[in-house]
């Protein structure tokens, strides 16, 4: 047999499907590796061949397309399971070839079991909804191509284990689930079960996603520096430890690089020849607003250090702010016996 361009095991496509449900898997060759599509390949006389390696086996074997009720079939560049079984788990290979050309790629397929409340090892996509933002929708994902547009499936939506009906602010609308006004209480896993008929049989597609309610862009503000502020003065004697916290609140903003940093005399702390350390802690609210605290610490401060400018800066996609800490050298208290006595004219 002639040499075949082997693209190896494409781990990018970690395909997970539920047991006892239909699954349609496109050959990744045409989507990611070759410059032409299936129709072009087919009309050029190339044949698409499928085979697989069972889980925990090394032996490649052909896929049996002669199972009862055509349980596994191929249609153009799609491999169909109607439905899947647990032992269909394995690495699947699609190979495109003729007498002079050969190209193949493998991908892992995992058939996953779910319980009656749709819990499973399936990796769930996360959909973020803005809190109190008006009507927002989620759509039942990855159901295209399973049935023709002439077929009208029935769709049932669940939150966790419970069928969604007569919920206050969540309304099923076919393939969509509408949140009239998203609240923290709407956090959770939502499942759509799509039921459709095909050749006298009934099939179910189960799709679960996680909804996370986050801060709304309507309420988003530039970073707010709570500390340092004008009310606190960091008064130290040389030799003492100087600790200045910078505490910043960030509104939740999708894909924002929230940042806090200190400058000392306009430079980054690393560039100043003093022994300064900065430690940071981060906490999140339930709507993923963020509070960052960076504590600037100088173990043994000098009188020179107490004359420097310490500025905390913060930036998010909403803007940038800065606040200087009020740092000063503590005036030593008078020693009574010497200074005060002198004042009384003692000799």
């Amino acid at each position: 047999s002639e040499r075949c361009d082997d693209w190896g095991l494409d781990t990018m496509r970690q395909i997970q499907v539920f047991e006892d449900e239909p699954a349609r898997i496109k050959c990744p060759l045409f989507e990611h590796f070759l410059k032409f599509n299936y129709s072009t390949a087919h009309s050029a006389g190339l044949t698409l061949i499928w085979y697989w390696t069972r889980q925990d086996r090394d032996l490649e074997e052909p896929i049996n397309f002669r199972l009862p009720e055509n349980r596994i079939s191929k249609e153009k560049d799609v491999l169909w399971f109607r439905p899947t079984l647990l032992n269909d788990t394995g690495n699947y290979t699609c190979m495109l070839r003729n007498t002079t050309y050969c190209s193949k790629v493998a991908f892992p397929l995992e058939v996953v079991q779910k319980d009656s409340c749709f819990n499973s090892p399936m990796k769930l996509p996360v959909h973020k909804l803005y809190i109190e933002y008006g009507i927002q929708r989620i759509t039942c994902p990855n159901v295209d191509g399973y049935f023709p547009s002439s077929v009208k499936p029935t769709i049932t939506w669940y939150m966790g284990c419970y069928k969604i009906q007569n919920f206050n602010n969540v309304i099923p609308e076919g393939m969509n689930l509408s949140f009239l006004i998203a609240l923290i209480s709407n956090n959770g896993n939502y499942t759509c079960v799509v039921t459709y008929p095909e050749n006298g049989r009934t099939f179910h597609l189960t799709r679960t996603l996680t909804v996370k309610v986050v801060g709304s862009p309507k309420n988003a503000v530039p970073p707010v520096i709570h500390s340092p502020n004008d009310h606190v003065v960091y008064e130290k004697e040389p030799g003492e430890e100087l600790l200045i916290p910078c505490t910043v609140y960030f509104s939740f903003l999708m894909d924002s690089r929230n940042e806090v940093w200190w400058t000392i005399d306009g430079k980054k702390p690393d560039d100043i020849t003093i022994d300064v350390t900065i430690n940071e802690s981060i906490s999140h609210s339930r709507t993923e607003d963020e509070t960052r605290t960076q504590i600037l610490s100088i173990k043994k401060v000098t009188s020179e250090d107490l004359k420097r400018s310490y500025v905390c800066h913060a930036r998010s996609a909403k803007g940038e702010v800065a606040k200087a800490a009020k740092v000063k050298q503590k005036v030593p208290a008078p020693r009574y016996t010497v200074e005060l006595a002198c004042g009384f004219g003692a000799t």
């Epitope: 894909d255 690089r257 806090v260 980054k268 690393d270 430690n279 940071e280 940038e320």
Partner: antibody, heavy 119, light 107 residues
Framework: QVQLQESGPGLVKPLGTLSLTCAVS?????????WSWVRQPPGKGLEWIGE???????NYNPSLKSRVTIALDWSKNQFSLQLRSVTAADTAVYYC????????????WGQGTLVTVSS | DIQLTQSPSFLSASVGDRVTISCRAS??????LAWYQQKPGKAPKLLIY???TLQGGVPSRFSGSGSGTTFTLTISSLQPEDFATYYC?????????FGPGTKLEIK
């Protein structure tokens, strides 16, 4: 003095996964810095791949986002890059770097490691 | 993405010369710009951050200026070790992008 050192295979097959590690010494990856990856194809300019904050939050170049993962390993004081489904266009010198927050730029860099994608 | 254009692409100069390299951003980036020096086979080295602040340990003959969309790196008196390629990088907006580089050669 902070030092960064990349390690990983110098040759990766097309469609394989490029995996590199950056060991950090002389400082902790728990400090408030962004740990970044930058690459440079032979004879070409620099391209920012992405970054991870000490808290684990990541940002990626959209041109690579679907294929890239950057992760931290606090116990080993190192961070890693995984680039999946590589092609010849991913052949480059890969650098790890430490970036400060805000406008501070990349102040510490590894020496770079050449990764060639070829069968 | 924000595009950075550097000019000139190539620059021939002599030891002792004063040289300036320009970096222009396709949109405003405030002062979120860094300058790097790279020698063949070596990693980039940070020279300037925040458009005009000299990185610790970098000779004072290097200086940076500019804000918004137009930035300049100046070397006041070229030394033999300064012949290298210089890159600007914007740190304002994702993805962070680099300029195409300016190669500084000995005349």
């Amino acid at each position: 003095q902070v030092q960064l050192q990349e390690s990983g295979p110098g040759l990766v097959k097309p469609l394989g996964t490029l995996s590199l590690t950056c060991a950090v010494s002389g400082g902790s990856i728990s400090n408030s810095n962004w740990w970044s990856w930058v690459r440079q194809p032979p004879g070409k300019g620099l391209e920012w791949i992405g970054e991870i904050y000490h808290s684990g939050s990541t940002n990626y170049n959209p041109s690579l986002k679907s294929r890239v993962t950057i992760a931290l390993d606090w116990s080993k004081n190192q961070f890693s890059l995984q680039l999946r489904s590589v092609t010849a266009a991913d052949t480059a010198v890969y650098y790890c770097a430490r970036y400060g927050s805000g406008p501070f730029g990349g102040d510490y860099w590894g020496q770079g490691t050449l990764v060639t994608v070829s069968s | 993405d924000i595009q950075l254009t550097q000019s000139p692409s190539f620059l021939s100069a002599s030891v002792g010369d004063r040289v300036t390299i320009s970096c222009r951003a396709s949109q405003g980036i405030s002062s979120y710009l860094a300058w790097y020096q790279q020698k063949p086979g070596k990693a980039p080295k940070l020279l300037i951050y925040a458009a005009s602040t000299l990185q610790g340990g970098v000779p004072s003959r290097f200086s940076g200026s500019g804000s918004g969309t137009t930035f300049t790196l100046t070397i006041s008196s070229l030394q033999p070790e300064d012949f290298a390629t210089y890159y600007c990088q914007q740190l304002n907006t994702y993805p962070f992008t680099f300029g195409p580089g300016t190669k500084l050669e000995i005349k």
